[in-house]
Interface confidence: low
């Protein structure tokens, strides 16, 4: 299917305002410290080009590549060299290796200032004003910290942002109706960023074999009733969907996304009977309906496996003849019966499977090998769920915020030399487990909690590559990809670290504690509580405990004194000296 | 979908004034925003007006305080009262609509300004 001009193709098919705003997104995902106005004046240039492609497709310039003229685009501003340094390099490289440049300069940590969220009546001014730009302003700022997030999604979620301030700028209490509404899609754009960085990792560190396996297990848990092929389609059409928004080929992504969704609405009875309500919507929405669609009924009179992967007189004349097909059936196979399992649970099962295998097909009598294959399942199916059950006892008995401090300190003394702005971020969004997945019922926990740790732990291992402190930390994010976690769990008390000094600069505190919000007082004491555990790795539970409670304390009695900075300068060292103490 | 059929146009003197109406069906539920487009003989289609479910508008500098968009929800039909008609205001007028962006389209209607 080629075209005369990629450039023109893409613009009529996507239509102009969803062509400008892929654009924006994919330049302010590599350019991610240039300014707004810089990136506005860039997505003209390329649109106003792309309508002379559409008005003339071999005007001059129009067959050029996507990437070609993107990245010339990319490579006129001035002041690339100053704000990017060797990234400038990039510029001196051919296509396609310009692009992977590009790529491998992508930040996900970027030093960006926090997002400060101003009074309701200056967004509802500045929404009012001009509307275009404020839409723009979003997906610019949210582009430039989220360096890989799935851009169709990043529309959709402008969409419900627009909609919001359309909705509350006009209400009586325009901050009761707005705020709500956009916390819910600051912690939803967190969530579907952290979920799509995992699905980049997949497939740019373990290949498209990793993220197809992934797709097999969850299209089968989704879509029971659809037939192996069918769902073979789905997961080929998937990961080239993805593979191209991991690739920053936005434009292709979106377009072929919006294709998927077609085939999947045009072709609902062959793949599950849950996606009626989704195909009445229109194209963005019904993407991210089909994306989140609940799994389909289980059909009724599924057959047991065995007759078919054990007692089969024929496993390794199949397995032979098509490896991976004939282990992409069992994949299939065992999701679509087991809803209750994580994706990363099945797809151990899978790599044992293949194992078992590999190891019984060349022995003298390949029947009588792996004829005991499903009980080798046992342990590694009961980790997840002993796993589960406890954590969430702890959670139902500590509540939130003491559960996260729990994990804190778990990990700082797994990996102690991880920054401790990472063991804070990543045991916070550990913690949150917890809330997301304890309270769902049995069938539905070890997926939820599993695979939420997966996409947690994902966080800690791309911003552990960017600067490698520990060597566990690499053993457990690069061996792997389904064993990630249960690495992470298997980790003990790093008996090598050599314990951090003690700084009393990090504990001392002052006044302004008192007038950060409820998060942000338990941010300080996390990180307070990280580097209790790096000067002390072998603190017990009690001694930490004890430390913490006479923090809180001390805190509560400054934040209620007269002269609350007097306060702090007095008890602050008294506190320092009792915890050293206390932990001596 | 959602369908749009615009009606209201034709020939008009210099100054004068027309209003143009769009009625919308389908799936309306999804709506956000609706919008007038206008495109003239060999020119490229430009924005005109924009108003959002809760009647917010924006108009480009060329038309702003000569023209008024409005919608009617409960008619499902969408409004442009257009006062002190130029010559250069001659195009075919687009009526749009859409949950973000509009990505539905009418037929267009045709508004001749001339002497």
């Known amino acids: 299917d080629t075209h005369k001009s990629e450039v023109a193709h893409r613009f009529k098919d996507l239509g102009e305002e969803h062509f400008k705003g892929l654009v924006l997104v994919a330049f302010s995902q590599y350019l991610q410290q240039c300014p707004f106005e810089e990136h506005v004046k860039l997505v003209n240039e390329v649109t106003e080009f792309a309508k002379t492609c559409v008005a003339d497709e071999s005007a001059e310039n129009c067959d050029k590549s996507l990437h070609t003229l993107f990245g010339d685009k990319l490579c006129t501003v001035a002041t690339l060299r100053e704000t990017y340094g060797e990234m400038a390099d990039c510029c001196a490289k051919q296509e396609p290796e310009r692009n992977e440049c590009f790529l491998q300069h992508k930040d996900d940590n970027p030093n960006l200032p926090p997002l400060v969220r101003p009074e309701v009546d200056v967004m509802c001014t500045a929404f009012h004003d001009n509307e275009a730009t404020f839409l723009k302003k979003y997906l610019y700022e949210v582009a430039r910290r989220h360096p890989y997030f799935y851009a169709p999604e990043l529309l959709f979620f402008a969409a419900r942002y627009k909609a919001a301030f359309a909705e509350c700028c006009q209400a009586a209490d325009k901050a009761a109706c707005l705020l709500p509404k956009l916390d819910e899609l600051r912690d939803e754009g967190k969530a579907s960023s952290a979920k799509q960085r995992l699905k980049c990792a997949s497939l740019q560190k373990f290949g498209d074999r990793a993220f197809k396996a992934w797709a097999v297990a969850r299209l089968s848990q989704k879509f029971p009733k659809a037939e192996f092929a069918e769902v073979s389609k789905l997961v080929t059409d998937l990961t080239k969907v993805h593979t191209e928004c991991c690739h920053g080929d936005l434009l292709e992504c979106a377009d072929d996304r919006a294709d998927l969704a077609k085939y999947m609405c045009e072709n609902q009875d062959s793949i599950s009977s849950k996606l009626k309500e989704c195909c009445d919507k229109p194209l963005l929405e019904k993407s991210h309906c089909l994306a989140e669609v609940e799994n389909d009924e289980m059909p009724a009179d599924l057959p047991s496996l065995a007759a078919d992967y054990v007692e089969s007189k024929d496993v390794c004349k199949n397995y032979a003849e098509a490896k991976d097909v004939f282990l992409g059936m069992f994949l299939y196979e065992y999701a679509r019966r087991h809803p209750d399992y994580s994706v990363m649970l099945l797809l151990r099962l899978a790599k044992a499977y293949e194992a078992t295998l590999e190891k019984c097909c060349a022995a003298a009598d390949p029947h009588e090998c792996y004829a005991k294959v499903f009980d080798e399942f046992q342990p590694l199916v009961e980790e997840p769920q002993n796993l589960v059950k406890q954590n969430c006892e702890l959670f139902e008995q500590l509540g939130e915020y003491k559960f996260q401090n729990a994990l804190l300190v778990r990990y700082t003394k797994k990996v102690p030399q991880v920054s401790t702005p990472t063991l804070v971020e990543v045991s916070r969004n550990l913690g949150k487990v917890g809330a997301k997945c304890c309270k769902l019922p049995e069938a539905k926990r070890m997926p939820c909690a599993e695979d939420y740790l997966s996409v947690v732990l994902n966080r800690l291992c791309v911003l552990h590559e960017k600067t490698p402190v520990s060597e566990k930390v690499t053993k457990c994010c690069t061996e792997s990809l389904v064993n990630r976690r249960p690495c992470f769990s298997a980790l003990e008390l790093d008996e090598a670290y050599v314990p951090k000094a003690f700084n009393a600069e990090t504990f001392t505190f002052h006044a302004d504690m008192c007038t950060l919000s409820e998060k942000e007082k338990q941010v300080k004491k996390q990180t307070a509580l990280v580097e209790l555990v790096k000067h002390k790795p072998k603190a017990t539970k009690e001694q930490l405990k004890g430390v913490m409670d006479n923090f809180a304390a001390f805190v509560e009695k400054c934040c209620k004194a007269d002269d609350k900075e007097a306060c702090f300068a007095e008890e602050g060292p008294k506190f320092v000296a009792a915890s050293q103490a206390a932990l001596a | 979908q959602v369908q749009l059929v615009e009606s209201g146009g034709g020939l008009v003197q210099p100054g004068g004034s027309l209003r143009l109406s769009c009625a919308a069906s389908?799936?309306?539920?999804?709506?956000?925003?609706m919008a007038w487009y206008r495109q003239a003989p060999g020119k490229q289609r430009e924005f005109v007006a924009r108003i959002s479910k809760g009647g917010s508008t924006n108009y480009p500098d060329s038309v702003k305080g000569r023209f008024t968009i409005s919608r009617d929800n409960s008619k499902n039909t969408l409004y442009l009262q257009m006062n002190s008609l130029r010559a250069e205001d001659t195009a075919v007028y687009y009526c749009?609509?859409?949950?973000?962006?509009?990505?539905?389209w009418g037929q267009g209607t045709l508004v001749t300004v001339s002497s």
């Open positions: 389908g799936s309306i539920e999804s709506i956000n925003r």
């Open positions: 749009a609509a859409g949950p973000v962006w509009e990505q539905f």
